[in-house]
């Protein structure tokens, strides 16, 4: 029997917002799991030098290296990084061993390196060794997973040629339409590329590494569904694989499926047939149509014709480069307050897209939806009624798509008042954008009536935090209201409001606010 | 190669103590826990608590706290543990085993067979 | 104390079937380790951490599991294989053993 290791070394990841984290470099709380670095015995070194197996860290992530030394008493110990000496607090845990902490946080280049750890016990000294790198994720791809044939079986591989390596699983369904989002029970997911049970409604296989995950759905004509009302459209670039399923349920086994293209039978090769019974014991039958490297001609319908079931067609358009098709001008939207309301987004793309809703230098995440017609929706509805401009945007591997929304509040004007030793001014952002009224108030107009023209500036601004419009108005000083109550009013469909100001010397007013509905 | 040895098969009265002796090779005895763990005939497996050699750190089960006492000696890489007030339901085989920093017992000795019988 | 509760207590199978025994912890803990046990032998470490192989043990035994529920399984069993296996933990201040599964031949 091998010895264990007599130290422990591990890495405890600590996610983004673990507010566990500590700034000292004795024992943070750990809630993630740690992973064994596997601390071996340093071959051809002089004395007990231990390394650890090498760490790799995104830019910004925090991490915890930690030695466990099973020798309980006094331990001293000290950190050496860059030829500098770093704090070390030991201490011990529940089990008497001895526990050695180092926290990096939010991971940068200069804390990359090799950080070396001495440990004294009363038994023996240790030299632990830890090398520390930012991973290189300029290197990693995910793709879109595609299908083939499996050699010699009736079978389909999924492929995703990503870097790292990606965690490959089919995603199926036997229902329909909603009932088969991600997480309905209806859903099945199966960890393996390959796939034997082909007969399933809803076949997608998915990918998903360090970037995210992308899924293919195998497109499916299904001969006992009313076709839709619009034909189903198909992109594809050139040299991609081509896959479309035709099933059909029949009574008995008395059918049989062809595909034809452009009313042209396919070639041998170019298809393959299975079928099976289902519970009730009807037989099912599926064709594959496949090619492995699409080319321009392979553009067209392809039909899928039963001897007992109508035929129903698919447009294949195999395309150069991708696309994103949508009408990219600016929208504008006034609603009420407690409108409900949404964005959205109607588009055509291939590949998919990946996209992003922004308002006031913020992302929110961005779901997709397909139509029966071919075409995508993307929607939002997550504005909370703040008035602003609302930016889409889309991309995929050889298109990008921007288009802008405003969105506008109807509600009465808030008026809110300044005065300086020169001048009054009133703004207000109700919207529709209100027109301006000055009033003075004198002996001859108790009930301030009596309108001021003179001296009188307005203007629209935007304000840049929301990208919303704010209105203000300004009266100049003349030495025929100084020392009078002036009240500017900021009126529009939905109302009135008007703030009444002493116009005496500068420094602070009093303000008195009237609400006019 | 790392071997504990332990002492061998002792037949006890209800009320006495038994001494049970460990003494390990092919390793740095103050490097390691050594553990107690016994067995009754047929039943599982129940720890006992454990010491550090060299050192007067001690750790006993809740269970024996009063009537087990471990020792060691350093001179001749040995652990004891002694259990008092015998009663028959002490009747099992008794391990001392080394414990590493991944906190399992990866060597045992061959076990002693207690029998407490009137 | 963490207690650990075996299941089945006893497995009987025949050799080159599939065994799968389990391991459940009263509340949540860290790592799970295995041992085996023969009649008359002292308890062999199988698996530590919860998943890492033991020095010479052979890779039809593996082992997974988190949190409170824990798995051994031994993909094809081989005549030598058939013994006692226990679980344990050392989460807490003192560690505690499963009761065991007896693998017996069927």
């Known amino acids: 029997n091998q010895d264990l290791p007599v130290i422990k070394c591990v890495l405890i990841n600590h996610k983004n917002n673990d507010s566990s984290v500590g700034k000292s470099s004795s024992y943070p709380m750990v809630s993630e799991s740690p992973e064994d670095l596997g601390c071996a015995l340093r071959p051809q070194s002089s004395g007990t030098v231990y390394e650890a197996a090498a760490v790799e860290v995104d830019v910004s992530a925090s991490i915890t290296l930690q030695v466990l030394v099973d020798a309980p008493g006094n331990i001293s110990c000290l950190w050496v990084f860059k030829h500098s000496s770093l704090n070390c607090q030991p201490h011990f845990d529940l089990q008497n061993r001895g526990v050695v902490s180092m926290v990096i946080l939010k991971m940068t280049e200069t804390q990359a390196g090799e950080y070396l750890l001495f440990i004294q016990s009363e038994a023996t000294n240790y030299t632990i060794l830890f090398t520390v790198s930012i991973r290189n994720t300029l290197l990693y791809t995910l793709r879109r997973p595609y299908f083939r044939k499996m050699e010699n079986q009736d079978a389909l591989v999924c492929i995703s040629e990503s870097v790292p390596e990606p965690i490959v699983e089919w995603v199926l369904c036997d229902s329909q339409g909603e009932s088969c989002k991600e997480e309905s029970p209806a859903v099945v997911k199966k960890e393996e590329k390959v796939l034997h049970e082909l007969f399933g409604t809803d076949i997608r296989c998915c990918a998903r590494n360090e970037l995210g995950r992308e899924c293919t759905r195998l497109f499916t004509i299904d001969l006992n569904q009313t076709p839709q009302t619009t034909l189903p459209q198909l992109f594809l670039k050139v040299g991609e694989p081509l896959w479309i399923r035709c099933k059909a349920v029949h009574v008995n086994h008395g059918f049989g499926l062809t595909w034809e293209l452009e009313n042209k039978a396919l070639e041998e090769g170019n298809y393959f047939e299975m079928s099976t019974y289902s519970t009730n014991r009807t037989m099912i039958r599926i064709l594959f149509a496949f090619v492995s490297s699409v080319a321009r001609n392979d553009t067209g319908y392809y039909t899928c014709s039963s001897s007992k079931h109508p035929s129903q067609s698919a447009l294949v358009t195999i395309v150069e480069k991708g696309f994103i098709n949508a009408t990219n001008s600016s929208e504008d939207y006034e609603i009420d307050q407690y409108e409900e309301f949404c964005f959205s987004v109607r588009f055509k793309a291939y590949p998919q897209i990946r996209c992003t809703w922004t308002f006031s230098r913020k992302s929110f995440p961005c779901e997709q939806k397909g139509l029966d017609n071919g075409y995508s929706i993307s929607k939002f509805c997550n504005h909370k009624h703040q008035p602003g401009e609302y930016i889409f945007h889309a991309e995929n591997d050889d298109a990008q798509f921007t288009k802008m929304f405003t969105l506008n509040i109807r509600r009465k004007p808030q008026v809110l008042a300044e005065a300086s030793a020169s001048q009054a001014s009133c703004f207000s952002d109700g919207y529709p954008l209100p027109s301006w009224t000055w009033k003075k108030c004198s002996d001859k107009s108790p009930n301030c009536t009596e309108e001021i023209t003179e001296g009188v500036w307005n203007r629209k601004a935007n304000r840049k935090v929301f990208g919303q419009w704010v209105s203000s108005s300004t009266l100049n000083m003349s030495e025929a209201i100084k020392g009078f109550l002036v009240k500017c009013c900021a009126y529009n469909s939905l109302g009135t409001s008007c703030e009444t100001i002493l116009l005496n010397s500068p420094g602070p007013f009093p303000f008195i606010q009237d609400n006019i509905s | 190669q790392v071997q504990l040895v332990q002492s061998g098969a002792e037949v006890k009265k209800p009320g006495a103590s038994v001494k049970v002796s460990c003494k390990v090779s092919?390793?740095?005895?103050?490097?390691?826990?050594i553990n107690w763990v016994r067995q009754a005939p047929g039943k599982g497996l129940e720890w006992m608590g454990n010491?550090?050699?060299?050192?007067?750190?001690?750790n006993y089960n809740e269970n024996f706290k009063n009537r087990v006492t471990m020792t060691e000696d350093t001179s001749t890489d040995t652990a004891y543990m002694e259990l008092s007030s015998l009663r028959s339901e002490d009747t099992a085989v008794y391990y001392c085993?080394?414990?590493?920093?991944?906190?399992?017992?990866?060597?045992w000795g061959q076990g002693t067979l207690v029998t407490v019988s009137s | 104390e963490i207690v650990l509760t075996q299941s089945p207590a006893t497995l009987s199978l025949s050799p080159g079937e599939r065994a799968t025994l389990s391991c459940s912890a009263s509340?949540?803990?860290?790592?799970i380790h295995w041992y085996q046990q023969k009649p008359g032998q002292a308890p062999r470490l199988l698996i530590y951490?919860?998943?890492k192989l033991a020095s010479g043990i052979p890779a039809r035994f593996s082992g997974s599991g988190s949190g409170t529920d824990f798995t051994l399984t031994i993909s094809s069993l081989e005549p030598e294989d058939f013994a006692v296996y226990y679980c344990?933990?050392?989460?807490?201040?003192?560690?505690?053993f499963g009761g065991g599964t007896k693998v017996e031949i069927k």
């Open positions: 509340s949540s803990v860290s790592y």
């Open positions: 951490d919860t998943s």
């Open positions: 344990q933990q050392w989460t807490s201040k003192s560690p505690t």
């Open positions: 010491i550090y050699p060299g050192s007067s750190i001690i």
């Open positions: 092919g390793y740095t005895f103050p490097y390691y826990w």
């Open positions: 085993a080394r414990r590493n920093v991944y906190l399992t017992f990866d060597y």
